[in-house]
């Protein structure tokens, strides 16, 4: 409980709101309202949010803190930032994984799960765009590989191997004849 504050307070302003009988100063972020002020324009009694709870903004009426969210292990989520008294846990995906939204109109609060990023190297392709907010964008086949169907096939190492037209163009067999 604070001492006597300056009497100039506006109940309709940002800093003081009518709580119970009087216009009271709100609680800072990370604190909840234990008891409203006991005099006009006084300080409310505010307590720090207990562990695993938070309040992100200055508030006047919150008599309890919000529970911190737990990242969904089933959806392969990890905590990018742990919960504090003033901020909720920030869940995301570990390196090498990307966010796949579970709803069509995706916003920051939308439910999501984590998918492993495509490894372009394992597909013998160039990495055109690195995986972060969406899956890796793979480009053309790496040197020594040619497009065949949906994948990249290794250039044959001898003339005995069959080398279709696309293979010949990439692997350079045509020049050998």
């Amino acid at each position: 409980q604070g001492g006597t504050r300056s009497p100039r307070c506006d109940c309709a302003g940002d800093f003081h709101k009518k709580i119970g009988l009087f216009c009271c100063r709100g609680c800072p972020a990370g604190h909840y309202l234990k008891a409203p002020c006991t005099e006009p324009c006084g300080n409310s009694t505010c307590l720090v949010c207990p562990q695993d709870t938070f309040l992100a903004w200055e508030n006047h009426h919150n008599s309890e803190c919000a529970r911190c969210q737990a990242c969904d292990e089933q959806a392969s989520q990890v905590a990018l930032e742990n919960c504090s008294a003033v901020a909720d846990t920030r869940c995301g995906c570990k390196p090498g994984w990307f966010v796949e939204c579970q709803v069509s109109q995706c916003v920051s609060s939308s439910p999501f799960y984590c998918q492993p990023c495509l490894d372009c190297g394992a597909l013998h392709r160039h990495t055109r765009l690195l995986c972060s907010r969406r899956d890796t964008d793979c480009g053309t086949c790496l040197p020594g590989f040619y497009e065949h169907g949906d994948g990249c096939v290794s250039c044959p190492t001898s003339t005995l191997g069959s080398c279709p037209e696309r293979c010949a163009a990439v692997c350079g067999w045509r020049q050998m004849f």
Epitope: T4, P7, R8, C11, K18, I19, G20, L21, F22, C23, P36, T38, E39, P40, C41, G42, H61
Partner: antibody
Framework: QVQLQQSGGGLVQAGGSLRLSCAAS????????MSWVRQAPGKGLEWVAT????????YFPDSVKDRFIISRDNAKNSLFLQMNSLRAEDTAVYYC????????????????WGRGTLVTVSS | DIQMTQSPSSLSASVGDRVTITCRAS??????????MQWYQQKPGKAPKLLIY???NVESGVPSRFSGSGSGTDFTFTISSLQPEDIATYYC?????????FGQGTKLEIK
């Protein structure tokens, strides 16, 4: 006209409980904070509890905090005082009163009072 | 808590006398230019009745012989011409901050 009709007083053993009621009429009950004030036999007035109008926050002096509960039923224009863990020193006439707010100064005065109800706590 | 000290604790006066009761608060009860102080009258066996609010404002329906004055910590309640029906105990009370506190009362008797 404004009326505050009290009930629920009586004799109770120390450690016991009692619930006082105050039925309000003649004014818009929801627009007023309400209080309880007590007076021990032959003694002065002592504020016991107040409940705010809109959000029903409650306030108590240290002498009754954690033992008394003030509540209101706006639908029934009624005020209540639940008194638990009663002690001999809680023996008094209990009055309910309306708190009128004056102007924009957040200033309250008890402008109407009930007739009082006697609570006797025997040890 | 704000302590309210009232004096005298009792007094005897004659009908027609000017009667003065004082009340001192342990700290200022001023807020935003208003003294958050009131005076109540309690007749024997009856509930208290509000007479004066904000130190000097006479409640509606209260006879004009009752008045109040003062600011900060020192307040005075006056009956300009005592009437037989004024026999009662008078209390000051502050609303500056909780807990609300009353003076111990002044018992007024007719000589």
């Amino acid at each position: 006209q404004v009326q505050l009709q009290q009930s629920g007083g009586g004799l109770v053993q120390a450690g016991g409980s009692l619930r006082l009621s105050c039925a309000a009429s003649g004014f818009t009950f929801t627009s007023y904070a309400m209080s309880w004030v007590r007076q021990a036999p032959g003694k002065g007035l002592e504020w016991v509890a107040t409940i705010s109008d809109g959000d029903s926050y409650s306030y108590f002096p240290d002498s009754v905090k954690d033992r008394f509960i003030i509540s209101r039923d706006n639908a029934k224009n009624s005020l209540f005082l639940q008194m638990n863990s009663l002690r001999a020193e809680d023996t008094a006439v209990y009055y309910c009163a309306r708190d009128r707010i004056y102007g924009s100064v957040q200033y309250y005065a008890m402008d109407y009072w009930g007739r009082g109800t006697l609570v006797t706590v025997s040890s | 808590d704000i302590q309210m000290t009232q004096s005298p604790s009792s007094l005897s006066a004659s009908v027609g006398d000017r009667v003065t009761i004082t009340c001192r608060a342990s700290e200022s009860v001023e807020f935003s230019g208003t003294s958050l102080m009131q005076w109540y009258q309690q007749k024997p066996g009856k509930a208290p009745k509000l007479l004066i609010y904000a130190a000097s404002n006479v409640e509606s329906g209260v006879p004009s012989r009752f008045s109040g004055s003062g600011s900060g910590t020192d307040f005075t309640f006056t009956i300009s011409s005592l009437q037989p029906e004024d026999i009662a105990t008078y209390y000051c009370q502050q609303s500056r901050k909780l807990p609300y506190t009353f003076g111990q009362g002044t018992k007024l008797e007719i000589k």
